[in-house]
Interface confidence: medium
């Protein structure tokens, strides 16, 4: 689709005569008929196959034709066509005299023709006007012409339709040849696909408008390249969504079980060596001169009560010294100059003579000890409490204060965490050295099998080492039922199970 445009510029008919030679009175009131047709080697009469147009009277005898002439006609004259421009044409321009106001052919005298020109040739589509001048013995016509495409038509023959758009169906403008040129931020055959934020992950992100990056379920971050770990995952990471791969030193389905208390909490003081001894438990090996569970106490050499027979101990830089009570001597006041006559036995102890009365021995009542019954018995010195229990003296008895998970007079019994049935939804409970673990039935997850799991999450086959994957609602969770010898949210950790497990 396009338009052949003809710009009439100047017509000269100095003598004011018709083609027949007759003069117009008072002058030739001139209008034009234009006929556009297909190329003919010799332009001959026949239909104006490409269109025709007539002007109103534009002037008398000789005149210049201005743009959009006041006579009501349009200049340039428009001859629209709705076909592929062939690149060639024939053009006939006739100048006619109008004695009256009726310009219809049948209303004109037969000899009203002033002049007639005919041209033909090739004419490419373009903005440039071609200027031409045709003369006859009595007249001269100056004009220019061109072919341009209609709005939205492009190409050498105005046959390529392209309508710029910026809406749901596409975002583009048109190139001179009619091809699409996408607006910034759009791509695709019709520029209908937004260009996402640079770096937006191809699979995990998408966009509905340019420079956007919307994450698919299970992914997060500006570029949707970070997976979202399992809900409740404490000390773990993921490489695919909803995983919980434990950081070093952590275990359990949610990586919330501390397997490396030493590293995470550094409980041992004063340069002591820490050894992990189970989940959330540890042992400190103290450097010389320190004591206590965490080696937090500085050890005085007097703490071991080296002075006998009521001698008092004094700390010194190079050790200690015993200040002996009257009647005793020696490094630890271990030698006595006393006899039973000096009543050396304290706290109701009875004195027994030895070596014909030259020395003695004290028989102490219960709860007292020492060569003179001067020391109260400490029933905790033998470390009677097992499993890290704390020993307390209570009058004539001693009591063990047990750590969580242990009981018995000596904390020698392990409490079963499974006794209170902590596993929900029919989960099976297994006691560990400290704590418990639940084996959940199909469709449940969580430390206590309290979380219902989705179906879709198993599609990616997240469970390892032959584990069974169970899913439920909401559709973004899974749980792995591990075979014997494996633990972890994906059954990724091999473990040696305690023999007490019931399977």
């Amino acid at each position: 689709s396009g338009v052949f445009q003809l710009q009439l510029q100047e017509f000269a008919n100095e003598r004011g005569v018709l083609a027949s030679g007759r003069r117009c009175e008072p002058g030739c009131r001139t209008f034009f008929r234009v006929c556009l047709k297909h190329f003919q080697a010799v332009v001959s009469p026949g239909p104006c196959t490409f269109g025709s147009v007539s002007t109103p009277v534009l002037g008398t005898n000789s005149f210049a034709v201005g743009d959009d002439s006041s006579g009501g006609g349009r200049n340039p004259l428009q001859l629209p066509f709705n076909f592929t421009w062939p690149g060639t044409f024939s053009l006939i321009i006739e100048a006619w005299h109008a004695p009256g106001d009726d310009l219809r052919p049948e209303a004109l005298p037969p000899d009203a023709l002033i002049s007639k020109i005919a041209i033909q040739g090739s004419l490419p589509v373009g903005q440039k006007w071609l200027l031409d001048e045709q003369t006859s013995p009595l007249t001269r016509l100056r004009y220019s012409y061109r072919v341009i495409c209609s709005d939205n038509y492009y190409g050498d023959s105005c046959s390529r339709l392209c309508k710029k758009r910026n809406d749901h169906f596409g975002h583009y403008v048109c190139q001179p040849d009619g091809s699409l040129s996408c607006l910034p931020g759009w791509t695709g055959e019709y520029c209908e696909q937004p260009v996402c934020l640079s770096g937006c992950h191809e699979q995990n992100g998408y966009c509905s408008k340019p420079a956007e990056c919307i994450c698919r379920p299970g992914w997060q971050g500006r570029l949707c390249n970070e997976c979202i770990p399992h809900n409740g995952c404490r000390h773990g990471t993921c490489s695919t969504p909803w995983q919980c791969t434990c950081d070093e030193g952590w275990g359990g389905l949610f990586c919330d079980q501390d397997l490396n208390y030493c590293t995470h909490h550094s409980p041992c003081k004063n340069g002591a060596t820490c050894s992990n001894s189970g989940q959330r438990s540890y042992t400190c090996t103290c450097r010389p001169g320190y004591t206590g569970v965490d080696c937090e106490l500085e050890l005085s050499e007097c703490d071991s009560n080296p002075c006998r027979n009521g001698g008092s101990c004094k700390d010194q830089e190079d050790g200690y010294r015993c200040l002996c009570p009257p009647g005793y001597y020696g490094l630890h006041c271990e030698h006595s100059t006393l006899t039973c006559a000096d009543s050396p036995c304290f706290n109701g102890g009875s004195c027994q003579e030895r070596n014909q009365g030259a020395s003695y021995a004290c028989e102490c009542p219960p709860n007292f000890t020492g060569s003179n019954c001067e020391k109260k018995v400490d029933r905790c010195t033998s470390n009677p409490c097992a499993n890290g229990g704390q020993c307390l003296n209570r009058g004539p008895n001693r009591v063990c204060r047990c750590r969580p998970g242990f009981t018995g007079a000596h904390c020698e019994l392990h409490i079963s965490d499974c006794a209170r049935s902590p596993c929900a939804h029919g989960g099976t409970c297994h006691d560990l050295e400290t704590g418990f673990v639940c084996t959940c039935p199909a469709g449940f997850s969580g430390r206590r099998c309290e979380v219902r799991i989705p179906t879709e999450a198993c599609a990616s086959g997240p469970c390892l080492n032959g584990a069974t994957c169970y899913t439920g609602l909401p559709p973004d969770n899974f749980v792995c039922n591990c075979p014997y010898g494996f633990v972890g949210s994906r059954c990724e950790f091999p473990v040696s199970m305690p023999p007490s497990f019931p399977w």
Epitope: N166, D167, S181
Partner: antibody, heavy 115, light 110 residues
């Protein structure tokens, strides 16, 4: 055609018969106007009827369709609400410009949603 | 969505120039195209396209109507105003979906 008074929650179907241009060549749209919210684009359909788009507030309730053989555009409105009260105009969609900037608009259909 | 803001009313004198403005909440210019239209609506009638792409006169619209602007600020000018021009004028952007209209400026006689 097809407007009038309707109760909230009920349905109504609007029709728009086109003439004077090649209907099947143009994307079409419904635009509505009410005194409070002014002019508001409602829905668009592609020239071949394959693609449709809706404003968020009518998505899932309104359906735009066309019959190119009859040069007719439709708007099926379900679960109507009082805020859908407006004059509804059909028009050729401005994404596909007419030569020389011509546009075709319907004369408008009044829809009142009230109990 | 792009919000278009127009002043509600403008009082004019016949034969004088009227300038109606429209401001967009973000630029509606893209690749040198200013994607803004102007419509005239007389009471009880459908809107009529006056200007497309900010400055192009629609088919059959008299030359006393003109449009200008780019980015976020656009203007419709009527010079001179005739009695027939007393109506409400709306701007509309085609930069983004959904298409949005301004609230309209009512041209009133002073």
């Amino acid at each position: 055609s097809g407007g009038g008074l309707v109760q909230p929650g009920r349905s109504m179907k609007l029709s728009c018969a086109a003439s004077g241009f090649t209907f099947s060549n143009y994307d079409m749209a419904w635009v509505r106007q009410d005194p409070k919210k002014g002019l508001e684009w409602v829905a668009t359909i592609s020239y071949d009827g394959r693609s449709t788009y809706y404003r968020d507030s009518v998505k899932g309730r309104f359906t735009i369709s066309r019959d190119n053989a009859k040069s007719t555009l439709y708007l099926q409105m379900d679960s109507l609400r009082s805020e859908d009260t407006a004059t509804y105009y059909c028009k050729d969609y401005d994404g596909h410009y007419h030569p020389y900037g011509m546009e075709a608009w319907g004369q408008g259909i009044s829809v009142t949603v009230s109990s | 969505d792009i919000v278009l803001t127009q002043s509600p009313a403008l009082a004019v004198t016949l034969g004088q120039r009227a300038t109606i403005s429209c401001r967009a909440s973000q630029s509606v210019t893209i690749s040198n195209y200013n994607l803004m239209q102007w419509y005239q609506q007389r009471p009880g009638r459908q809107p009529k396209l006056l200007i497309y792409d900010a400055s192009n006169l629609a088919s059959g619209i008299p030359a006393r109507f003109s449009g200008s602007g780019s980015g976020t600020d656009f203007t419709l000018t009527i010079d001179p105003v005739q009695a027939d021009d007393i109506a409400t004028y709306y701007c509309q952007q085609s930069r983004d979906d959904p298409r949005t209209f301004g609230g309209g400026t009512k041209l009133e006689l002073r």
